[in-house]
């Protein structure tokens, strides 16, 4: 799978994680930090 960094406009899209662009799927994706979940890594779980 080809990935690259998200466009500048997506800075801040992922609240607790890193935004990556999945080129083959034409999708932005939030890779969440440990302890966070949700489309935008907005939910904390224990």
């Amino acid at each position: 799978v080809s990935i690259t960094k998200c466009n500048s406009d997506m800075n801040g899209y992922c609240l607790h994680g890193q935004c990556i662009y999945l080129v083959d799927m034409s999708q932005n994706y939030c890779r969440c930090e440990v302890g966070y979940t949700g489309v935008r890594c907005e939910h904390f779980y224990l």
Epitope: N7, S8, D9, G12, Y13, L15, Y21, S26, Q27, V39
Partner: antibody
């Protein structure tokens, strides 16, 4: 399936304000950004601004700063674009556009006519 | 704001011709450019995103290329149904549309 349903056509007098709504279904607007784009009759496409409904952060094109207000009500999954001090040049079709995980998905457009 | 200079503003070509439209950005947009087709009375239709990624259902005669500040949109063999106005859109840093190119049949 995912939808963005915009409010109906409006006719306004110069100097008045207009508020266009954009109701999302099939997805949560908190997962997206909502952009607003307009197109005057016979003219090109013009980006106006956008809101991040989760953070409640807005960004506007400089030429609209101070005259446009974009808001979102996450409880009703609806975004709004209000344009004030209307003039005849604001006569246009106004589109809301979803962006975020997937690329842009457009509403059907709302015609706003400014006429005395 | 990033500026997008699209050219030409209009063109006339024959059915079967190769048609090329260019967009130049005022700064590097890292391949984050999309191309839209718009027919009179209709909302814009997304053809290509991320420079060259064709949307599902879009004919393969449409293609895109470029990097940095210079991007190209090509129709390899113009068809009567391709008569429309085409717009580029940079979405690297906020959004800016090009001025549009009206494509007509000779």
């Amino acid at each position: 399936q995912d939808q963005l349903v915009q409010s109906g056509a409006e006719v306004k007098k110069p100097g008045a304000s207009v508020k266009v709504s954009c109701k999302a279904s099939g997805f949560n607007i908190k997962d997206t950004y909502i952009q607003w784009v307009r197109q005057a009759p016979g003219q090109g496409l013009e980006w106006m601004g956008r809101i991040d409904p989760l953070r409640r952060q807005t960004k506007y094109r400089e030429k609209f700063e101070g005259r446009v207000t974009i808001t979102a009500d996450t409880s009703t999954n609806t975004a709004y674009m209000e344009l004030s001090s209307l003039r005849s040049e604001d006569t246009a079709v106004y589109y809301c556009v979803r962006s975020g995980r997937e690329f842009d998905f457009w509403g059907q457009g709302t015609l706003v006519t400014v006429s005395s | 704001d990033i500026q997008m200079t699209q050219s030409p503003s209009s063109l006339s070509a024959s059915v079967g011709d190769r048609v090329t439209i260019t967009c130049k950005a005022s700064q590097d947009i890292h391949k984050y450019i999309a191309w839209y087709q718009q027919k009179p009375g209709q909302a814009p239709r997304l053809l290509i995103q991320y420079t060259s990624t064709l949307q599902p259902g879009v004919p393969s005669r449409f293609s895109g290329s470029g990097s940095g500040t210079d991007y190209t949109f090509t129709i390899s063999s113009l068809q009567p149904e391709d008569i429309a106005t085409y717009y580029c859109l940079q979405y690297d840093n906020l959004r800016t549309f090009g001025g549009g190119t009206k494509v007509e049949i000779k």
